[in-house]
Amino acid sequence: EDGGPACYGGFDLYFILDKSGSVLHHWNEIYYFVEQLAHKFISPQLRMSFIVFSTRGTTLMKLTEDREQIRQGLEELQKVLPGGDTYMHEGFERASEQIYYENRQGYRTASVIIALTDGELHEDLFFYSEREANRSRDLGAIVYCVGVKDFNETQLARIADSKDHVFPVNDGFQALQGIIHSILKKSCIEILAAEPSTICAGESFQVVVRGNGFRHARNVDRVLCSFKINDSVTLNEKPFSVEDTYLLCPAPILKEVGMKAALQVSMNDGLSFISSSVIITTTHCSDGS
């Protein structure tokens, strides 16, 4: 992929994009913004979906981790011809629908929504958009909004999780490139390492989970460390401390040598999880080691 910062988090990422008539002459800028951002999420466990809305919401690319399908999805996105009204709620409906299906499958993967719009939403449309964004949140999603040009920041702060989850682009569509780094930094929740990565069988330990974005939760009291043991049992532990780049967590006592615990983090009290390829293994420790 292209250079610069990247995100290694394993979660489901939904782009909800305004393709109403008002973006007709700016679709290229929207496309390049999404294309460049999409390439920065590089975990093999990350899945992505492209949703567009105008007078209707359409899922242009259904949730997939397949990089070839994502490439084809981006090609389809480039061909979009904007037109119609700004029914943003329809975009959120299409995201909620997919989250609902995935939850039902038992995956409970964390979901991040990045919704982009220009212009103000008229009263009814704002009400519906806020309602549908709330439904996505009820299903466990973190919602970010990108507002370009004539957007209403107060509206977007209510559609997004908070004012801090809104990215205002006041200088028009060409300035979208300038917020890629800050969106990546804010929307990326990733687990990079665990210290120690090997623990003694049968003993209690604390684990430092290194990563990024752990304080992006709406409520840091709802952050959990999760240990999926030998691909079967999952144990959730409340961290002693939550910082943006690390969590301090009690590790479960793993009785036998050679047991493996895959590390996950929940930002919403176990409703959904950020996955990683970080594994903690047990070893035999003799006395005094």
């Epitope: 899922t59 242009l60 409906e93 299409r94 909620s96 629908e97 439904r135 299903l139």
Partner: antibody
């Protein structure tokens, strides 16, 4: 396991109001994301969706019947109630309640409502 | 709302593959679900989210969806599969059903 049961069928006179109750077990309406829908099927015809109530008490209605329908829930009793005003013989159908959000994974057995004078 | 169109009837010989279509404008951009209904019984969900099979549904039932057509495929059709089949999707806070297809196993 999940079960839904509609209140017994009825003979309703034209212009009267129909009230149907769906009593369910095996799931909770306080859990986020789901909900309960009402669907009907006139004899020998297709399924027609009527109304849905979500866990957070949001409601949605069939556009063509919106003015005649009201859906409500009693979470403590595990019940969802549908009322339909101004009944007409064309409303004769089997009425089903079903669990789901974007699709319906469990259905009641249905109750036959006949509208006739 | 989107309109879902199904053929009124489809016939298939036992052991053969039955395909039931559900068409609508750009239906590939939304999710489609399928129900089986036998006479005098309530519908049963056989496929959801285009191609996912609920537990307890035989593997011979599969689904696909792209462009303007979603398809329910029953491979190795059995006599017990004779029923009405309905496609359904979700559009603008409404659930929308197709008109139904009667599958006859010859």
């Amino acid at each position: 396991q999940v079960q839904l049961k509609e209140s017994p069928g009825a003979l309703v006179k034209p212009t009267q109001t129909l009230t149907l109750t769906c009593t369910f077990s095996g799931f909770s309406l306080s859990t986020s994301g789901g909900g309960v829908s009402w669907i009907r099927q006139p004899p020998g015809k297709a399924l027609e969706w009527l109304a849905h109530i979500y866990s957070n008490d949001d409601k949605s209605y069939s556009t063509s019947l919106k003015t005649r329908l009201t859906i409500s829930k009693d979470t403590s009793k595990n019940q969802v109630v549908l009322t339909m005003t101004n009944m007409d013989p064309v409303d004769t159908a089997t009425y089903y309640c079903a669990r789901g959000g974007y699709f319906l994974d469990y259905w009641g057995q249905g109750t036959l409502v006949t509208v006739s004078s | 709302d989107i309109e879902l169109t199904q053929p009124p009837s489809v016939s298939v010989a036992p052991g053969q593959t039955a395909r039931i279509s559900c068409s609508g404008d750009n239906i590939g951009g939304i999710y489609v679900h399928w129900y089986q209904q036998k006479p005098g019984q309530a519908p049963v969900l056989v496929i959801y989210a285009d191609s996912k099979r609920p537990s307890g549904i035989p593997e011979r039932f599969s689904g696909s969806n792209s462009g303007n057509t979603a398809t329910l495929t029953i491979s190795g059709t059995q006599a017990e599969d004779e029923a009405d089949y309905y496609c359904q999707s979700y559009d603008i806070t409404s659930l929308v059903f197709g008109g139904g297809t009667k599958l006859t196993v010859l």
